[in-house]
Structure formats: C-alpha cells, structure tokens
C-alpha cells in the first residue's frame, strides 16, 4: 500500500487585503478514514483554521464538494483577507481516533497579504519657529504589507535630504508602519511653502499616497518696525507713523506709549496679505506739541504672536518751530529690532 501523501502545490500565495485566498491541498489516498484539518502555523501553538469534519468557520469554505467521498481535493477558500491572516497554512490528515492521530502534514503554503498603507499623516512642530531655524516634520503611515516601502519628502517640489525613516517592526509581522522625520530650514519666504510626504508601495500600482503640511503652521516671521514723523500740521499736531512690515502670522498687538504711558492699543485684524503671505500694518499717532512743555518720547511697542514685545522709540522736540518739518527731531531705538531706524521727516 503506497504511503499517503498530502500535497500543497504552492509554497506561497499573495493576496490583496479584502480579496479571497485559495489554499490548495490534495491527498493521494482517502485511507485511512479520518478528517483533514487546516492549521495556521506549526507546533503546539498552531491555530485551527478549518476542520472538514465539523465546526463553524464562517470565512472558510471548501473549494470542492466535501460530500463526495471520492473527492481528494481538500482545498479551502478564505474570504475577506486581512493582514492578520498572513502566515503559513498547513493541510493535515488525521486518522480517526480518540484523539484523532495526526498522520501527515502538507509542506505548508505561506499566505502573504498585500495591504495598502494608510494615508500619510504629516505633523509639524508644536510651536512656531522663526526663519533661519530648522524644524522637524513627521510623517506616519500604517497597516501595509509587504514591508518594502519608499518614502520621500519634498519642499515646494524639491526633494529633501535631511531625512530619517524607520519601518517597524524590524522582524516578520502581519503588517508594518513607517515613520519618517524631515528637518526643514525655514526662510522668511516660506509662509506659502508646503512639505509633502510621498509614500510608494507595491499595492498602490505606481500611484503614491501623499500627505502635506503647510509651513504657515510652523513658521513665525517677525515684523520689521519703522517709526517716522510726517510734516507738522498748522494746528501744532505732529503725525507719527509706526510701520510694521513683513510679519506672519497676523496675530499682533500694537501699543503707543507717550513718555512711557500707554496712549492707545490696537489689534491687527483683516489685513491684506502680501504676495509672500506676510502682512503689513501702519499705525498713526497724532501728538499735540503745544500741549507739552518738554520733548515727547513716543514708543511704538509691538507684541507679535505672543512673543516678547519689540519697541521703537521716537523723540519729538517741542522747542522746534511749529512750521518746521521735524528737522530738530531725533529718534531713539530700544528693544530688539530687525534694523535701526533714525527719526527725521521723510
């Protein structure tokens, strides 16, 4: 009597998540009487997948009619495959007994599941950084299989090179995750810039997934301040202008101080946007020179996006002839500024 053979013709089968997988198995003889069972994995911890003798396995069906006694095909079909179904499946013949006695196992068929990566999620720094600083962006994508995957970073269409990428876990798994960090040097022109994380995988058929982040969420462009005096008017009033330029985001509070005392506070709102995404704002203060016996020290104090205030001061000389246009005026700088501005009429 020839020895019973359990034949699993495919060493491996690859299936897309959501599809059905067919695992083939035939036996060379139906003797001795006893069940065929399918297991995932080998050894004592193996998992019963299908028992042709009995049981309820809603996702598994026999490919051939199991009621035909002369049928030697014990192939099964598993529906709605998920990455969790990956593994090596064994078709095993038992001899009827108490307990059933394992007679022979097939060589096994490795089922690999092709699962698409999730849409990449890009996250930027928790706090804004100023131009000329480097910030980190992270990109994450999960649930893909097989492990091979390509991730690229772009800033305004140009590939970034300061990138660190990890795929986890390092060993065999039903599915994998990728996490990548890109370091991006900010410039003042980056308000409209965008970083893109692009993920390519065999399941995507050449159409990579992209996740984006706007640098506008990560950048702070501090303002330039310029204080100037306009011509003195006939009614002894001096018009002093504070020009706040090239800042982002719009959140900005401006306070005028006269000789250290708060004169007026304003909040920026509904400002028109510059081409580069930054904002400008101009504030005027009318000073009645005749009401002052001494020189008036005017300070334009700007608090931008919760940062420490920046001041620009300007002295109005009361002794000057009212009709003169500030030729005897002088400006004074205090605080941290992008550039120095000296007073005088423009």
């Amino acid at each position: 009597e020839e020895e019973l053979q359990v034949i699993q013709p495919e060493k491996s089968v690859s299936v897309a998540a959501g599809d059905s997988a067919t695992l083939n198995c035939t036996v060379s003889s139906l003797i001795p009487v006893g069940p065929i069972q399918w297991f995932r994995g080998a050894g004592p911890g193996r998992e019963l997948i299908y028992n042709l003798k009995e049981g309820h396995f809603p996702r598994v069906t026999a490919v051939s009619d199991p009621t035909k006694r002369n049928n030697m095909d014990f192939s099964i079909r598993i529906s709605n495959i998920t990455p969790a179904d990956a593994g090596t499946y064994y078709c095993v013949k038992f001899r009827k007994g108490s307990p059933d006695v394992e007679l022979k196992s097939g060589a096994g068929t490795e089922l690999s599941v092709r699962a698409k990566p999730s849409a990449p999620v890009v996250s930027g720094p928790a706090v804004r950084a100023t131009a000329e600083h480097t910030v980190s962006f992270t990109c994450e994508s999960h649930g893909f299989s097989p492990r091979d995957i390509t991730l690229k970073w772009f800033k305004n269409g140009n590939e970034l090179s300061d990138v660190q990428t990890n795929v986890d876990p390092a060993g065999k798994s039903v599915s994998y995750s990728i996490r990548s960090t890109a370091r991006v040097l900010l410039t003042r022109r980056d308000v409209h810039s965008q970083v893109i994380c692009e993920v390519a995988h065999v399941t995507l058929q050449g159409d990579p997934l992209r996740g984006t982040a706007n640098l506008s969420e990560a950048i702070r462009v501090p303002p330039f301040l310029e204080v100037t005096q306009q011509s003195m008017r006939a009614d002894n009033q001096v018009n002093v202008t504070c020009q706040v330029t090239k800042f982002y985001p719009q959140r900005l509070q401006l306070t005028w101080l006269e000789n250290g005392n708060v004169s007026r506070t304003e909040m920026a709102s509904a400002l028109p946007e510059n081409k580069d995404g930054t904002y400008n704002w101009t504030s005027w203060l009318l000073v009645n020179v005749s009401a002052h016996r001494d020189d008036v020290k005017l300070t334009c104090q700007v608090e931008h996006d919760g940062q420490p205030a920046v001041n620009k001061s300007f002295s109005v000389k009361v002794s000057a002839h009212p009709k003169e246009q500030g030729s005897n005026t002088a400006a004074e700088n205090t605080g941290t500024n992008e550039r120095n501005i000296y007073g005088g009429s423009g």
Partner: antibody, heavy 118, light 107 residues
Amino acid sequence: EVQLVESGGGLVQPGGSLRLSCAASGFTLSSYDMHWVRQAPGKGLEWVSAIGTAGDTYYTGSVKGRFTISRENAKNSLYLQMNSLRAGDTAVYYCVRGGVWDDAFDIWGQGTMVTVSS
Amino acid sequence: DIQMTQSPSSLSASVGDRVTITCRASQGINNYAAWFQQKPGKAPKSLIYTASSLHSGVPSKFSGSGSGTDFTLTISSLQPEDFATYYCQQYVSYPYTFGQGTKLEIK
C-alpha cells in the same frame, strides 16, 4: 437518488448458510466504507461487519470466522456470506453506507429478515 | 469493546416538551458519536454525527452535544412524529457499538 436495497433474507436451519446482497444506486459503492447492521426482534441495533475502500474487512466477535463481507464493484453491490448460522443470528439485516470523512453512517437500506430456526 | 450506556431506557413526554437523552461511553471516543431514530417496522434514520452535526434534511429541533465520554441528544419541541426509539453509537473504532436505545412515548 442515493439508495440501498437489501435482498437474500429468508428462513434457514441452524448450521445452514445464506448470502445477503445490497444493491447500491446513486453513488459508487467502492468509494465508501460499507457496513452490515442487524436487529434481533424486539432488540436494539448491533453492528456486524464492515468493508473499507481498500478492501479491508472487520467483524464483530460473535460472527468472526462464520461471516464474510465482500463487494462487487462492477455490480455496485455489497454482500454478506453467512455460514454456520445460529438461532442468535435471527434478525433484520441492514446495509449501511459509511459517511464522508469519518465513516459516520448516513444511508440505510430498508432491511432484509433472516430467520434461523429448525 | 467500547460500551455505550443510554439513559433513560424509556421516557414519557407530551407534545411541545423539550427532552434530553444521554449516552455515556466506557472510554473516550473524541466526538465520534452518532444518534439515530427508529420507528416500529422501519429502518433507522441518521440524525446526528460527530456529536453535534446534523445530517442533511434533519430538522433543527434536533441537536447534539458532548465530547469524550458524555453525549446528549435534545429535541427542543416534541411533535407527534418524534415519538420513536433513539439510539446512540460510537464509531471511533471497531467494533462499532450502539446504546441499548431510549423509547420515547407519548404521555
């Protein structure tokens, strides 16, 4: 339709012989383990004999050496040759098909009566 | 040989009742237990195999359970046609053996 029809029963004297036949239709008899089961009048069921797909044969202790099970594939038929019959062999004899994976009985014939009496 | 002991040997019940018949094997038989129904003058009919699987065409009011040595047949709601004799059987090893039968009668 899957069917089993027994024949060959009757009255026989102790020590005599009888050959029971079981004609199968609707399936190939040689692909299944086949059995004979008997039931003495007013008693329960008793398994008698079986023949496997490889031609291997099995008997209950009380009939060993006296009964022989066989099949004829060309006629799709099962047989039970009964020799040295005793009064205790009096029963209705049923031909039964063993089921798909594990030989669970699934199809029964209507039975044929064997009476051993002088 | 493996002995199959059925209980009770007879049982009176009414239409609509739920009844349970038990069978104990003298040694472990895995789940290779079967149940049969026989009416007077008729051949037995196969109801259940591998302890709990219903043969094709058998109504779901019949159910079986058990593994090892103890097995039960339950009929959920008795109908007039269910009054008959029921047999259990082990078919794990030769010689296959039957229980002595349980006669289910109308009360």
